[in-house]
């Protein structure tokens, strides 16, 4: 809960001008949903819808919240102190490896292969093969038979987007 | 329930120090910040500071800076806040309130009188 | 330090009547702005946060709105038990400061 965020944890893009050393470090940080002032005396609020800060801090300025792109459903907007929640659409997914977009569901598996698990925001339905029950893993083929089956419906928030 | 049970009525002489206590019970001691709020005989609300229990880290109105020390007891789930040099204008009742993210205040404290008479 | 400016001052109301009491600004606030309804004895206790946000349990007749400089506190239909003194307070910067307070009595 004590966590804390500093200029130095930021990307470069988000660093903002150096800050004077203040000499009490307990004295020097502004609680989630502030930042601190330029002289490094006062916390001042983010911008509700606007802005966060999710940690104790001496960033000069906030952080701005995502807005959730088209293709996402916003699941909890952003407050001064947590960035919005976005999730991939029914249908949809968003896998570890291209966080930056949802990607459509596959709507059956290939022949040969029984859908084990139905698709959710985070993956795509999964497909083991009949006989060995070993997952299929890689792109169905371009021509396939397939088993169709009603995209799942979302049940918890993926990782956030932005 | 979350509850904010403050320690009882002082009468100090001008020059002394008083200290206060606020107990937290009903939620989680170290995830919230405490401030500390006056508020003199018949007048209005000033806020003096706050500690976060969680990290130690605390703030202090300027005015109240070099005379106000703020301090935290995990193991007991108090906050402190002691005054020093009283004068008679400190006279007041203290109020412990908690800092809900992003609201202020969304629990306070019954009060403290503290009345500085010679 | 952000100044706040409560009127009126004090104001008496029937029960049923529709009150407002409005707090100023010094300096922008960007909407961080609380009210509490003080009753003799009692410590304050929160109304409204971020102008206009309903605190959980408290009676749908109040309801607070603006935004700037510019923030009101409105009770819809005025009930006996509602006699307190009324305190804005901004929680944009520290250090964070209280209107001086409007007392509300029923006549």
């Known amino acids: 809960e004590s966590a804390l965020i500093t200029q130095q944890d930021l990307a470069p893009q988000q660093r903002a001008a150096p800050q004077q050393k203040r000499s009490s470090p307990s004295e020097g940080l502004c609680p989630p949903g502030h930042h601190i002032s330029e002289d490094g005396r006062d916390c001042i609020s983010c911008k509700y819808g606007q802005d966060y800060s999710t940690h104790w801090n001496d960033l000069l300025f906030c952080l701005r919240c995502t807005r959730c792109d088209s293709g996402e459903v916003e699941l909890s907007p952003c407050t001064t102190t947590r960035n919005t929640v976005c999730q991939c659409e029914e249908g949809t997914f968003r896998e570890e490896d291209s966080p930056e977009m949802c990607r459509k569901c596959r709507t059956g598996c290939p022949r040969g292969m029984v859908k084990v698990g139905d698709c959710t925001p985070w993956s795509d339905i999964e497909c083991v093969h009949k006989e060995s029950g070993t997952k299929h893993s890689g792109e169905v083929p371009a021509v396939e038979e397939t088993v169709t089956s009603s995209p799942g419906t979302p049940a918890s928030p993926c990782s956030l987007s932005g | 329930e979350v509850q904010l049970v403050q320690s009882g009525a002082e009468v100090k002489k001008p020059g002394a120090s008083v200290k206060v206590s606020c107990k937290a019970s009903g939620y989680t001691f170290t995830s919230y910040t405490m401030h500390w709020v006056r508020q003199a005989p018949g007048q209005g609300l000033e806020w003096m500071g706050w500690?976060?229990?969680?990290?130690?880290?605390?703030k202090y109105a300027q005015k109240f800076k070099g005379r106000v020390t703020m301090t935290g007891d995990t193991s007991t789930s108090t906050v402190y806040m002691e005054l020093s040099s009283l004068r008679s204008e400190d006279t007041a009742v203290y109020y412990c309130?908690?800092?809900?993210?992003?609201?202020?205040?969304?629990?306070w404290g019954q009060g403290t009188l503290v009345t500085v008479s010679s | 330090d952000i100044q706040l400016t409560q009127s009126p001052s004090s104001l008496s109301a029937s029960v049923g009547d529709r009150v407002t009491i409005t707090c100023r600004a010094s300096q922008d606030v960007s909407g961080a702005l609380a009210w509490y309804q003080q009753k003799p004895g009692q410590p304050p206790k929160l109304l409204i946060y971020w102008a206009s946000t309903r605190e959980s349990g408290v009676p749908d007749r109040f309801s607070g709105s603006g935004s700037g400089t510019d923030f009101t506190l409105t009770i819809s239909s005025l009930q006996a038990e509602d006699v307190a003194v009324y305190y804005c307070q901004q929680h944009y910067i520290t250090p964070f400061t209280f209107g001086q307070g409007t007392k509300l009595e029923i006549k």
């Open positions: 309130a908690r800092h809900e993210e992003g609201i202020y205040f969304d629990k």
């Open positions: 500690i976060y229990p969680g990290g130690g880290y605390t």
